[in-house]
Interface confidence: low
């Protein structure tokens, strides 16, 4: 984990005046000047009443304010004389001492209170040296760290009990540990005090660093009893337009000319072709003039443009229909979603003075008029002897983004005379034993002047056809058999030739015994 911070509550190392701690009895611990291992002047306490048995010498520090800390650490530096190196001493010589503390809400202690004994003082530990020394050695300094808690009052005293050692207390430092403010996973966690126990885990809530966003919540880090961070929960990541820097402690804006479309730990990338950024922290690069992105294009894709016009439009006119064919545009604009639209305009008037307007809705385009993928269309139901302009537009996924209309190639054509369309309906006006009088509506699209009509009829049971011609849109068929069913079809003729026959219609003659011509209702084709 991250290195722990230690904050000092009290340290004798930096005190050069008298410590003036309380000792009991007065013949026990004694304050003297000395030097630490770096030869700095320090105040120490010594005791060496080894020649007398039943020693019980206490030393108490001044009041130490707690500062909301729950667990306190004490670092002791001391030397202890080896009992075996001291001649003529009783067996009560010790090489250990005891560490205690006492909590209070203010500096209430006196020479006699609290009583100099375990309870009210709370024992922390018996402190033994790693090395003791003989008279011939230089004093070997031992360092021990002990901790205690949880603390709840405003402050505390430390106390040291000697029971017959020859020792020197060189320095005492009371401190607490905290986890230093840190950045992890693009989140910032504040300085956090350790908990009451060495095993405590204190939760520190996190906040995303600038230009980062949460990717999993909650954001928290645990501060353990040693002042080290552990078990990160949740994470942040760099926002769009920002890339990681300084070992995940910063999210740096993308420099101009680069972008980052997605949040995450990826780097900023150079702008795709035909795009740019002019300011930092771009999540998308804006397209150059006349270049665009379709709504379905990702921010990572290049900007593209509209296609150039289709090339080589060829028309093949057949009476009132035609086939248009063309080639792919020279420039597809960098896209592969090319489509074609065919715009039909009917022109009136002669030469350059002609005015053109949109074609009627009945003009038919096969396979369709708009959104063609193929480069061919069949157009029918045009008017005869009429001038038309057809515009073949090339469009792609960004044509809708362009302020300009699609680019097109145009072709002008004039339709030929077409044969008339089919005669729609036949009506029976009267019938007798030997005749039928019929009429019909002219074709919907005569496509010119109708010269005459040709009627084909036959008796249904025989199937041998006869034809008659009429310049009117009615005819009387004579010389028919009574009580017979006839099948009749009519077609119109213009200078362009005959049109299609009408659908077959059936009519009956009456019996010869019937009185005169019988008026029948109109019969529609079956």
């Amino acid at each position: 984990g991250c290195r722990a911070l230690e904050e000092t509550l009290m340290d004798t190392k930096w005190v050069t005046s008298e410590l003036a701690w309380t000792s009991h009895p007065e013949s026990g611990w004694e304050e003297v000047s000395g030097y630490d291992e770096a030869m700095n002047p320090i105040r120490t306490y010594q005791v060496c009443n080894v020649r007398e048995s039943s020693q019980n010498n206490w030393l108490r520090t001044g009041f130490i304010w707690r500062r909301d800390v729950q667990r306190v650490y004490v670092e002791l530096k001391f030397t202890v004389r080896d009992c075996n190196s001291i001649p003529n001493i009783p067996g009560s010589c010790k090489e250990t001492f005891n560490l205690f503390y006492y909590e209070a809400d203010s500096d209430v202690a006196s020479a006699s209170s609290p009583f100099w004994m375990e309870n009210p003082y709370v024992k922390v530990d018996t402190i033994a040296p790693d090395e003791s020394f003989s008279r011939l050695d230089a004093g070997r300094v031992n360092t021990k760290v002990r901790s205690f808690g949880p603390l709840s009052k405003a402050g505390f005293y430390l106390a040291f009990q000697d029971q017959g050692a020859c020792m020197s207390l060189i320095s005492v430092r009371a401190f607490y540990k905290k986890c230093a403010s840190t950045t992890a996973g693009f989140a910032l966690f504040p300085e956090t005090l350790t908990g009451a126990e060495p095993t405590s885990l204190v939760i520190a809530p996190g906040t995303c660093i600038p230009n980062a966003v949460e990717v999993s919540v909650p954001l928290k880090l645990y501060c353990n009893g040693d002042g080290e961070w552990m078990v990160p929960v949740g994470a942040c990541t760099c926002a769009t337009g920002h890339e990681p820097a300084a070992k995940e402690s910063q999210c740096r804006p993308c420099p101009p000319g680069s972008y980052k479309a997605k949040q995450g730990e990826g780097p900023c990338l150079p702008c795709p072709p035909n795009s740019r950024t002019t300011s930092p922290a771009a999540s998308i690069c804006t397209c150059h003039n006349n270049f665009y992105r379709a709504d379905s294009d990702s921010a990572d894709s290049a900007c593209t443009t509209v296609p150039s016009p289709p090339r080589g439009v060829i028309s093949n006119v057949n009476e009132t229909s035609l086939i248009l064919e063309w080639s792919e545009p020279r420039d597809l604009g960098g896209r592969d979603d090319l489509l074609y639209n065919v715009i039909c305009k009917k022109c009136h008037g002669a030469g350059g003075a002609s005015a053109c307007s949109r074609c009627d809705d009945n003009v038919e385009f096969v396979p369709r008029q708009l959104g063609l993928t193929e480069r061919r269309v069949h157009i029918s139901h045009l008017l005869a002897h009429t001038r038309y302009t057809f515009e073949v537009q090339a469009v792609n996924g960004v044509s809708g983004k362009s302020p300009l209309p699609p680019r097109y190639a145009a072709v002008n054509i004039t339709t030929n005379q077409a044969a008339p369309s089919e005669v729609p309906t036949l009506r029976l006006h009267s019938s007798s034993g030997s005749s039928l009088t019929l009429s019909w509506a002219p074709p919907e699209r005569p496509n010119g002047v109708i010269l005459d009509y040709e009627m084909k009829y036959f008796e249904k049971s025989e199937g041998i056809a006869s034809t008659v011609t009429s310049q009117m849109n009615s005819v009387q068929l004579d010389g028919l058999r009574p009580d017979a069913r006839y099948v009749v079809q009519v077609r119109a003729r213009t200078v362009a030739g005959y049109g299609q026959y009408s659908r077959p219609a059936e009519f009956e003659t009456t019996s010869e015994r019937g009185s005169g011509a019988q008026q029948l209702q109109e019969q529609l084709p079956l």
Epitope: G257, D297, D300, A302, G334, R335
Partner: antibody, heavy 113, light 108 residues
């Protein structure tokens, strides 16, 4: 570790077609254009074109427009380049490369009868 | 099409020498779109410097790039034996993307 994998070599006859593959792993395939680059023996680098793996959109160097067709298969994280009507001039190492700076090892194409 | 002209075409240098390769564009390009590649024989090109002056990941600090408009350069502060390679500049300003013809750097 980002990897862009290409087959080592292809041997084809003149007039035939070949489809070179380029498989990308361990990064978002659809996030970056896939570029194709040609290098003739002892020569420099020529950009053929690129393809957008997210929608199949392409850009071509005019010089290679009738020679190369670029496609992608998103399901397998693979980009393809089809080269048609092959001649000895098409014998080269073909690299695929993805932004930002990941290159395949190249496929050596030999056109020979 | 933007044409990139590199010079010199080939050069030989001793270890410790300072090397400069130039790349001239036929029309002005943004410094964000000029990149340098290193290619060793038998290997694919490796991105060396992107956006004119940014070192790609893992590239030694002896390499540096600079330039603007139509004039760009790649510098090797102190040549090392492992720098023997062909160096290409590349523009990404407009399609088609183009490369310089390359500068072959040899050991003297």
């Amino acid at each position: 570790q980002v990897q862009v994998q290409q087959p080592g070599a292809e041997l084809v006859k003149p007039g035939a077609s070949v489809k070179l593959s380029c498989r990308a792993s361990d990064y978002t395939f659809t996030s970056y254009w896939m570029h194709w680059v040609k290098q003739r023996p002892g020569q420099g680098l020529e950009w053929i074109g690129n393809v957008n793996p997210s929608n199949g959109g392409t850009n071509y160097n005019e010089k290679f427009k009738s020679k190369a067709t670029l496609t992608v298969d998103k399901s397998s994280n693979t980009a393809y380049m089809q080269l048609s009507s092959l001649t000895s001039e098409d014998s080269a190492v073909y690299y695929c490369a993805s932004n930002p700076g990941y290159w395949g090892q190249g496929t050596t194409l030999t056109v020979s009868s | 099409e933007i044409v990139l002209t590199q010079s010199p075409t080939t050069m030989a240098a001793s270890p410790g020498e300072k090397i400069t390769i130039t790349c001239s564009a036929s029309s002005s390009i943004s410094s964000n779109y000029l990149h340098w590649y290193q290619q060793k024989p038998g290997f694919s090109p490796k991105l060396l410097i992107y956006r004119t002056s940014n070192l790609a990941s893992g590239v030694p600090a002896r390499f540096s790039g600079s330039g603007s408009g139509t004039s760009y350069s790649l510098t090797i502060g102190t040549m090392e034996a492992e720098d023997v390679a062909t160096y290409y500049c590349q523009q990404g300003s407009s399609i088609p993307l183009t490369f310089g013809a390359g500068t072959k750097l040899e050991l003297k």
